[in-house]
Amino acid sequence: HTAAQDNCTCPTNKMTVCSPDGPGGRCQCRALGSGMAVDCSTLTSKCLLLKARMSAPKNARTLVRPSEHALVDNDGLYDPDCDPEGRFKARQCNQTSVCWCVNSVGVRRTDKGDLSLRCDELVRTHHILIDLRHRPTAGAFNHSDLDAELRRLFRERYRLHPKFVAAVHYEQPTIQIELRQNTSQKAAGDVDIGDAAYYFERDIKGESLFQGRGGLDLRVRGEPLQVERTLIYYLDEIPPKFSMKRLTA
């Protein structure tokens, strides 16, 4: 659990409290909100990050057509229940005993119900489509340069194995990044595509989760890439179960 030794902080998660309590005075850190120990050598799970975000005082469509089963996170923020490994629990409930099932990125995948609602398993989100619109530029970006830069970003900043970045599409001004990661592909120690996508989403919004690093400065051949709109679609290994009423709304 390597963290910056000089002042004991977590490089990959600023929403932590750290202490030099490890062997040899090594830094160890806990996520705010949950009090769960986190590994600062990799990304913190989205569930723990959302929980930390909710515990903090409140301060201040298409190149690839998303499948009919693609989910968009319309419900916004909530205070999630995380399992002992920091993953989302399959069933989430609010203070008023309204419950729903979520996928591995914490997005609702069923109608809301009561405490009797059953969510038998945490369904994995295996395909994430990040849809970006960039601000006007003098000309279009070179597609291969853009592709290389975004792949480098996910590899170096988010530590996501390159094989999980399936494709980068570009039709000015829309960029799409496809992340794919089946249960069978994800080895121990691999960053989850859901966590990488969440860190990227927060970076794009200027709300970096990294400790002490500057905000995201995306450049393609020196030209700033400024994003003005982001949409993220989530595809699960098992299609979501919504009533017809919602699907036709």
Partner: antibody, heavy 119, light 107 residues
Framework: QVQLQQSGPGLVKPSQTLSLTCAIS??????????WNWIRQSPSRGLEWLGR?????????DYAVSVKSRITITPDTSKNQFSLRLNPVTPEDTAVYYC?????????WGQGTLVTVSS | DIQLTQSPSFLSASVGDRVTITCRAS??????LAWYQQKPGKAPKLLIY???TLQSGVPSRFSGSGSGTEFTLTISSLQPEDFATYYC?????????FGGGTKVEIK
């Protein structure tokens, strides 16, 4: 060598407030690397962590759910100490109360204070 | 909350014996476990942290091992001053929780 010295009454009436203080020597309550805890021990419940406070550019508190609605842990930087308030108390709160330093390991403990809740 | 179950609850042993105490966690806690020794009327004293790291000043006859859900504290050769109660503590997630204790008595 860090030393923690506890003080506070040993007898508290039901429905009243239990107040204990832990004076720190050899460290600072506002140290950005220390975490300060309260723990209690009783025959019925064993060792039970109650909560903690620590300073990391601002103060953070965490409490056990079992006492969350009744507990307050407060640092006092001027006296280099931190205190525990539990309100209201019942006879089930009768226990030996300890303060301790640490987060992933409690390496220094106070001497303990037996608090009896009785009318 | 994570439950810790210690076994045995009581243990009778003689000076020089090798003693092993087990602590089982209700969920995986990696190596986030500490061991404490407590004598009557005294505060607990840290022996082992991070499952196997010996706290400074603690005799080397104490050792800890394990990861995940099963942990052991071993005293290689029991000394007269080791007769006490031993507790494990998980430090992976709040609330931090303790085992029920193992009392080591003189046979």
């Amino acid at each position: 060598q860090v030393q923690l010295q506890q003080s506070g009454p040993g007898l508290v009436k039901p429905s009243q407030t239990l107040s204990l203080t832990c004076a720190i020597s050899g460290d600072s309550v506002s140290s950005t690397s220390a975490v300060w805890n309260w723990i209690r021990q009783s025959p019925s419940r064993g060792l039970e962590w109650l909560g903690r406070t620590c300073y990391r550019s601002k103060w953070y508190n965490d409490y056990a759910v079992s006492v969350k609605s009744r507990i307050t842990i407060t640092p006092d930087t001027s006296k280099n100490q931190f205190s525990l308030r539990l309100n209201p108390v019942t006879p089930e709160d009768t226990a030996v109360y300890y303060c301790a330093r640490g987060d992933f390991r409690f390496d220094s403990w106070g001497q303990g204070t037996l608090v009896t809740v009785s009318s | 909350d994570i439950q810790l179950t210690q076994s045995p609850s009581f243990l009778s042993a003689s000076v020089g014996d090798r003693v092993t105490i087990t602590c089982r966690a209700s969920q995986g806690i990696s190596s986030y476990l500490a061991w404490y020794q407590q004598k009557p009327g005294k505060a607990p004293k840290l022996l082992i942290y991070a499952a196997s790291t010996l706290q400074s000043g603690v005799p080397s006859r104490f050792s800890g091992s394990g990861s995940g859900t099963e942990f052991t504290l071993t005293i290689s050769s029991l000394q007269p001053e080791d007769f006490a109660t031993y507790y494990c503590q998980q430090v992976k997630i709040y609330p931090l929780t303790f085992g029920g204790g193992t009392k080591v008595e003189i046979k």
